[in-house]
């Protein structure tokens, strides 16, 4: 008789990443009988919600339902109907909503309430929407990449199933860059974590991990740019800001009210004699780099060593996966190759920033001007943050791996979040089981 395929015994989970600049929905899938195995969960879909981050809906909360519709409908299509009711849905909001909450808990609650009501209308098992902490964001990002890289598996392999694998159980550090915050998370080498707020203890698959993490709120690429503009306009002699972080010939008008809308620019706030100013690009990497460095206060450190702004940072240890905007920006600039040295990256950034805006627009005709205009700043910011902020060097640069996906799953906090909430990362190593039931009869 012919072998007949039995229905797949699989489970699904949905996580929405409500970031500062946009929301993404991720669908994960795993074999039901292998829930506790490491590396079995994988991403089957990513749907990017059209529009800005949810924190921008303060004045139009009635539009949140429509905003989420396309991606939630996509989830309905991808996940078999029979599985809908048992598929958990989680929404985690990150730094954009942390900033909104800092301004007003009422406004943040209102946005989350409407999001919850909208998501409850779908046939899935909605588990709630919440603002995750920066510590969680860092920790879950670290769990995600190490889970996908097979670092929690106790089985030693003679073959490599994933890129970047050094075939040892040394975990990778995680470097995450968003629009409003950036996270650094890694296991330091025999180093006491001097600041309790930065220390995490995990027991995963029978092994203990002492993890360092910190989330720098306001140091995501978009908020860092707002900070830089607010700092630089303080010393401008008139309403023209000649900015080295934008291409020569680039011009843009900025409203002062928009500049001071975010808590991130509070320290630079002053009464200006104009309501608007014009950015005029001059495209100079070195000057841009110098201006960015002024955002990092390195003069004060109450610990044995710090990153910046008095935040403890142990000596860097091992390899790091740099993902989210670290990857997107470097990918656009064609700088993600393992073979590209830090000196070469700097050289390429100098050339890129110096290119006239008209030339850039022609070369990248398919890219939205809003995003295109900011790659010089973002690339320079990434270099400044990694080198001066986190103290990577030309030598240790080779330990940074710019990662978009691992085994088809996006690097980011969402997978780690779901694994944790669905109790799929056991503290102890699961007992090895016999061969799983055959899916064929």
């Amino acid at each position: 008789t012919q072998n007949k395929a039995l229905p797949e015994n699989v489970k699904y989970g949905i996580v929405l990443d409500a970031g500062s600049s946009h929301t993404s929905l991720y669908i994960y899938k795993w074999p039901a009988e292998k829930e506790n195995d490491t590396g079995v969960v994988h991403q089957v879909e990513e749907c990017r919600v059209k529009g800005p981050g949810i924190s921008k809906f303060v004045q139009k909360v009635n539009e949140i339902g429509i905003y989420l519709t396309d991606c939630m409908e996509r989830a309905r299509e991808v996940i078999p109907r029979s599985q809908h009711q048992e598929t958990p849905v989680y929404l985690g909001a990150t730094a954009g909503m942390r900033l909104l909450r800092m301004e007003s808990e009422e406004l943040a609650d209102r946005v989350l309430d409407v999001v919850e009501r909208s998501l409850s209308n779908y046939p899935f098992d909605f588990q709630g929407a919440r603002i995750i902490t920066g510590q969680e964001e860092g920790a879950y990002g670290w769990i995600t990449i190490n889970y996908l890289l097979g670092k929690f598996s106790q089985k030693t392999r003679w073959f490599s199933i994933v890129p970047y694998e050094t075939n040892n159980q040394e975990t990778f550090g995680a470097l995450d860059l968003g629009g409003a915050s950036t996270q650094v998370t890694f296991v330091p080498q025999n180093q006491t974590i001097e600041s309790p707020d930065n220390a995490l203890q995990f027991r995963l698959y029978g092994k203990d991990y002492n993890v360092y993490t910190h989330s720098f709120l306001c140091y995501g690429k978009d908020q860092a740019l707002w900070q830089k503009l607010a700092k630089d306009i303080q010393v401008a002699s008139n309403e023209i800001l000649r900015d080295p972080c934008f291409h020569p010939g680039y011009k843009k008008v900025v409203n002062v009210s928009d500049l001071y809308k975010t808590p991130c620019t509070k320290r630079f706030e002053m009464t200006l004699p104009f309501q608007q100013f014009e950015i005029q690009g001059i495209g100079n990497y070195q000057q841009c780099h110098q201006s960015i460095l002024e955002l990092f206060n390195t003069s004060y450190c109450p610990y044995s060593q710090c990153a910046f702004n008095g935040i403890f940072l142990p000596p860097l240890q091992g390899d790091f996966g740099a993902f989210s905007a670290f990857y997107f920006v470097m990918k656009f600039l064609n700088l993600t190759s393992e073979k590209v040295s830090q000196e070469k990256v700097t050289e390429m950034m100098k050339k890129f920033c110096a290119q006239p805006w008209e030339e850039i627009k022609t070369s990248y005709a398919g890219v939205k001007e809003k995003y295109l205009s900011e790659y010089c700043f973002s690339g320079t910011y990434i270099l400044s943050l990694l080198l001066q902020g986190y103290h990577f060097t030309a030598d240790s640069w080779e330990h940074i791996h710019f990662i978009g996906k691992i085994q088809g799953s996006d690097a980011g906090w969402t997978l780690g979040y779901m694994l944790n909430l669905t109790n799929m990362i056991p503290a102890e190593q699961p007992l090895s089981t016999p061969l799983s039931h055959s899916t064929y009869v």
């Epitope: 942390r98 800092m102 808990e105 009422e106 943040a108 808590p263 620019t265 509070k266 630079f268």
Partner: antibody, heavy 116, light 111 residues
Amino acid sequence: QVQLVQSGAEVKKPGASVKVSCKASGYTFTDYNMHWVRQAPGQRLEWMGYIVPLNGGSTFSQKFKGRATITVDTSASTAYMELSSLRSEDTAVYYCARGGTRFAYWGQGTLVTVSS
Amino acid sequence: DIVMTQSPDSLAVSLGERATINCRASESVDNFGVSFMYWFQQKPGQPPKLLIYGASNQGSGVPDRFSGSGSGTDFTLTISSLQAEDVAVYYCQQTKEVPYTFGGGTKVEIK
């Protein structure tokens, strides 16, 4: 759980300065603003100003501009309010309160007495 | 500045009876569909305790007998059935705009 613990009572002479501390625990200190509110004996509560612990930016009620300073030590999760050129009418209980727009958590209060 | 006017200044109510306190703002304290209006309870020698936020939402651990209503400029705090432990001074506050301002307080006593 969230806690705000303030420094002890102070007695000051007119013209002097006072610095009150507020140590926070149970949450990420830099995720919320810290406000200062005072209450003179038998009077209504009076908002003085707030700080963004994240970056040290502050905003004051016009009445206290130039005379009050709010600072933070993020490594110690502590906010400070300093009031200079004290006069007898500054005799009050000074409170710190955590919040953006919702003052859900308050310190126990610090009595500052200004007397010659 | 937004001026917050509370009435009455004091109120004596029998145990188990309803107590109603009013607060009027000199201009609307609503923004983005939210009322930035808060009610606090303060007992002697203690810091204020948040009872109601956003005009009508109960603070954490606040008994159900406390409720808030209103929008724009006129707001009400109601204690549906006064208990002995409710004897205190009650303040309204707006945080729509700086400077954040408080009402003059209403002293609630038992008749």
